[in-house]
């Protein structure tokens, strides 16, 4: 969390951002809140990016003002217009690109003053893994697949019964480049699994960590997966 204050002769207002990550090809949100004004006419929101000449986005006097917008963001940005009045300056970024990563500044002017805060935005690819029993294999084998990751992640297997065990000798992980030549499909196979046990396939890079669990018993198979973005720090 980054909290910024204004530094002009005018009063300062509090602006708060949260570091976040964008998933390539999907829409992302750059989060920013500020001390709200009671009227829309005096609110100005400017989003800037370090190293970029033009503005990322500008909203003033109740509408988007995009004449100074940088070409790389053309047609890809929007604020939540109905929430500006209650202090939400967050920016929706459409079709996140790898090159969108960097340091952004959320700069706010209201009738009460000015303020700004920086935000670190990481980009990459991350997806939920799915773990299945591989019935084609000669021995009991689990197959963990996740369709889109970048940068290349690490894959670690764990088991509830054999806590702390190292499965690197009995697992094999491959990375297959997807058609857009950036993201990769992750496939990891775990051999010699035992029933009545819960296995976890953990995929992690510097942006996200995802886990796929599978519980194999004689009567049923239960699956669960979750994904967590790393380094979501507020500012």
């Amino acid at each position: 969390l980054i909290i910024g204050f204004g530094i002009s002769g005018r009063h300062s207002i509090t602006v708060t951002t949260v570091a976040s990550a964008g998933n390539i090809g999907e829409d992302g949100i750059l989060s920013c809140t500020f001390e709200p004004d009671i009227k829309l006419s005096d609110i100005v929101i400017q989003w800037l990016k370090e190293g970029v000449l033009g503005l990322v986005h500008e909203f003033k006097e109740g509408k988007d003002e995009l004449s100074e917008q940088d070409e790389m963001f053309r047609g890809r940005t929007a604020v939540f217009a109905d929430q500006v009045i209650v202090g939400n300056a967050s920016l929706r970024l459409k079709n996140v690109q790898l090159t969108d990563a960097g340091t952004y500044k959320c700069y706010i002017i209201t009738s009460k003053g000015k303020g700004n805060a920086n935000l670190e935005y990481k980009t990459g690819a991350f997806s939920m893994p799915e773990v299945n029993v591989d019935y084609n294999a000669s021995s009991e084998t689990l197959r963990c697949e996740a369709p889109r990751w970048f940068p290349q992640p690490t894959v670690v297997w764990a088991s509830q019964v054999d806590q702390g065990a190292n499965f690197s000798e009995v697992s094999n992980t491959s990375f297959e480049l997807n058609s857009e030549n950036v993201t990769m499909k992750v496939v990891s196979v775990l051999y010699n699994v035992t029933i009545n046990n819960t296995y976890s396939c953990m995929i992690e890079n510097d942006i996200a960590k995802a886990t796929g669990d599978i519980k194999v018993t004689e009567s049923e198979i239960k699956r669960r997966s979750h994904l967590q973005l790393l380094n979501s720090k507020a500012s």
Epitope: E35, P36, L40, D82, V86
Partner: antibody, heavy 115, light 107 residues
């Protein structure tokens, strides 16, 4: 859930003052404006003013300056409005409403000014 | 001060009808207009903010449109529970101002 509790009614003498309360719960009181509005039968709604508890910023409708004074007690998440030198023109229902969108309204306090 | 004019004080309707309530601002308020519903004996309730954004939990038969000075609030198919007074309001500049209200009643 969000709640704004206001007393149902109050009877006051002409020339007197009254302090109306609005107790908030279910959200972070300090982070939203609290607005006050007046409704008289056949007159429509009028905005009196708003206060931002976190900073103490206050905005008044010029028409109500000198008539209404807005304050807050952040420790009890309560907003107050003082009305002074009351006349029959001040007889109305007074509402408190959360944030700049007036997204949630209290039930209103009926103020009757009568001798 | 910005004056918000609701041209109809009363509107008669039947259940299932499409109803359109208009509101005109005396100067440009961009899209900073909200619509509220007030039923008898109740406090007002936010339906639409920033011209066209339905507030949480508001049925999709309620819609809003417009920009600048002319705004419209539509109920696509009136239900019995929609009989109420509807107010427009601008939050573009202070003082914040409301329309006089349009009372929706049964024919």
């Amino acid at each position: 859930q969000v709640q704004l509790q206001q007393p149902g009614s109050v009877l006051v003498r002409p020339g007197a003052s009254v302090k109306l309360s609005c107790k908030a719960s279910g959200y972070t009181f300090t982070n939203s404006w609290m607005n006050w509005a007046k409704l008289r039968p056949g007159q429509g709604l009028e905005w009196i003013g708003g206060i931002y508890p976190n900073s103490g910023n206050i905005e008044y409708n010029e028409k109500f300056k000198g008539k209404a004074t807005l304050t807050v007690d952040t420790s009890s998440s309560t907003a107050y409005m003082d009305l002074t030198s009351l006349t029959s023109e001040d007889s109305a229902v007074y509402y408190c409403a959360r944030d700049s969108r007036f997204s949630y309204w209290g039930q209103g306090t009926l103020v009757t000014v009568s001798a | 001060d910005i004056v918000m004019t609701q041209s109809h004080k009363f509107m008669s309707t039947s259940v299932g009808d499409r109803v359109s309530i208009t509101c005109k601002a005396s100067q440009d308020v961009r899209t900073a207009v909200a619509w509220y519903q007030q039923k008898p004996g109740q406090s007002p309730k936010l339906l639409i903010s920033s011209t066209s954004y339905r507030y949480t939990g508001v049925p999709d038969r309620f819609t809003g449109s417009g920009s600048g000075t002319d705004f419209t609030f539509i109920i696509s198919s009136v239900q019995a529970e929609d009989l109420a007074v509807y107010y427009c309001q601008q939050h573009y500049s202070t003082p914040l101002t409301f329309g006089a209200g349009t009372k929706l009643e049964l024919k």
